[in-house]
Interface confidence: low
């Protein structure tokens, strides 16, 4: 029966990469059905409840804070909720990560971050965000400054001693504009990452426009240059009729 | 420590209406959601329904719908459950429960003993 | 609704002996995704109020003696009584707490010989 409706969402408030003692806020999606919201944290396939709120759906979306945030309290979270007949519906599942140096100092090394073909591109164009690191890295994730959705993640490719993997950005639309940051994980804890790279901008860059302003601004200087011209020889026609007379 | 002190016993003729009482202490009321279970010779326990000490919302049992009210003041952590058209049917002991995080319940009230009787 | 079905209604037992009551459910308890059976068993000693044993179907309440254990899983379910003792006359009842329309059983009344 849980079929019937469309799955709730919930969300982080603000980036789902959280740096070490953090917080972050969760929102879960009131249901109009539910009389009891609980935010679980899924951990080894079991399910630990996180917190719960008592608000029904006509007040505002449940909300939760988790604070000093660690590894153990990043992962996978759910929101359950408890409604008349049906007695559980579930959320989406937000992953949440932590940032910081890891206790065994694996993840001490940040990864760098470049871009190819050039950080300022036009819209339509193919970017590629190449995230590098000397050091062991199983995964790597790429998160966008302000963004609220999960970071991309891409198992890396061990190239010749260095592990790096390549997001592909293609085509490039105004949205991919922002400053971006990877960031290196291992596969004991996907969910605890390293300290991230150097920010790197990436400019989206409308060069139809700039181009048509730019032609704009050169034939106004042509066309400013032509009066000037047509002037000076005017202004040149009449002093030599005056030195004829 | 948590303690439910429900009103006591009541005595009413058919037809009126009555107002059982359970307050909470010992914890922070508005934390747990506040059951009602009837229980009668005929019936053993009945599920009468539930009430956010939180917001006031409800969730009753259909066969109880209309029969009972379930109400709650924050300000003295107290559930209220009001029982309307008294008949002998509803002669019974009425237990308030409180429900814990894995949906049971932890704690229960002494419960109140209701007789309907002309 | 779900429909809970305790067997047997009452049994009289000397002290010391070992005691086992059934409680079936009309439809499955378990919940897949938290791996819990919602069902709880309660003891209502004459004169008191009901008092939970059990809960998670297994999971035994603090304070409770180790004398009692829930068993069973989806609809089959059952309360064990290791040794039983003169305190434990009462009346067992199980709720399922899997539909928010809980339902409890009829109860199995246990006496003492």
């Known amino acids: 029966q849980e079929g019937d409706f469309p799955m709730p969402f919930i969300s982080a408030k603000s980036s789902p990469v959280i740096p070490l003692d953090g917080s972050v806020k969760i929102q879960c999606q009131a249901i109009r059905e539910a009389y009891l919201t609980q935010l679980m944290i899924i951990k080894n396939s079991t399910y630990r409840e996180i917190g719960r709120r008592l608000k029904f759906w006509n007040e505002t979306d449940p909300e939760f804070v988790i604070d000093h945030m660690d590894a153990n309290k990043a992962g996978r979270y759910q929101c359950q909720y408890r409604i008349g007949h049906y007695r559980f519906r579930y959320s989406d599942t937000l992953e949440l990560v932590v940032t910081g140096e890891e206790p065994a100092g694996r993840l001490r090394d940040r990864p760098s971050l470049s871009v190819r073909p050039s950080p300022s591109v036009a819209p339509g164009e193919n970017v590629t965000l190449l995230c590098q690191s000397g050091n062991r890295t199983d995964t790597f994730l790429l998160s966008k400054e302000g963004a609220a959705h999960r970071p991309l993640r891409l198992r890396s490719q061990d190239q010749d001693g260095w592990y790096q993997a390549e997001f592909s950005l293609s085509p490039v639309t105004s949205a991919h504009g922002g400053t971006y940051r990877c960031y290196r994980s291992l596969s004991t804890n996907p969910y605890l990452l390293s300290q991230p790279s150097e920010p790197l901008a990436l400019l989206v860059a409308d060069y139809t426009m700039q181009n048509l302003i730019r032609m704009g601004l050169a034939a106004s200087v042509l066309l400013l240059l032509g009066i000037l011209l047509c002037q000076a020889r005017h202004d040149h026609g009449g002093a030599r009729e005056a030195a004829r007379s | 420590q948590v303690q439910l002190q429900q009103s006591g016993p009541e005595l009413v003729r058919p037809g009126v209406s009555v107002k059982i009482s359970c307050k909470g202490s010992?914890?922070?009321?508005?934390?747990?959601?506040m059951h009602w279970v009837k229980q009668s010779h005929a019936k053993s326990l009945e599920w009468i329904g539930v009430?956010?000490?939180?917001?006031?919302?409800?969730n009753y049992n259909q066969k109880f719908k209309g029969k009972a009210t379930m109400t709650v003041d924050k300000s003295s952590s107290t559930a209220y459950m009001e029982l309307a058209r008294l008949t002998s049917e509803d002669s019974a002991i009425y237990y308030c429960?409180?429900?814990?995080?894995?949906?049971?319940?932890?704690?229960w009230g002494q419960g109140t003993t209701l007789t309907v009787s002309s | 609704d779900i429909v809970m079905s305790q067997s047997p209604s009452s049994l009289a037992v000397s002290a010391g002996e070992k005691v086992t009551m059934s409680c079936k459910s009309s439809?499955?308890?378990?919940?897949?995704?938290?791996?819990?059976?919602?069902l709880a068993w309660y003891q209502q000693k004459p004169g008191q109020s009901p008092k939970l044993l059990i809960y998670?179907?297994?999971t035994r309440e603090s304070g409770v003696p180790d004398r009692f254990t829930g068993s069973g899983s989806g609809t089959d379910f059952t309360l064990t009584i290791s040794s039983v003792q003169a305190e434990d006359l009462a009346v067992y009842y199980c709720?399922?707490?899997?539909?928010?329309?809980?339902?409890f059983g009829g109860g199995t009344k246990l006496e003492i010989k």
């Open positions: 009430i956010s000490t939180y917001s006031g919302n409800t």
């Open positions: 010992g914890y922070t009321f508005t934390d747990y959601v």
């Open positions: 998670w179907a297994s």
């Open positions: 709720k399922q707490s899997y539909n928010l329309m809980y339902t």
């Open positions: 429960a409180r429900e814990s995080d894995g949906y049971y319940f932890d704690y």
């Open positions: 439809q499955s308890l378990l919940n897949s995704r938290t791996r819990k059976n919602y």
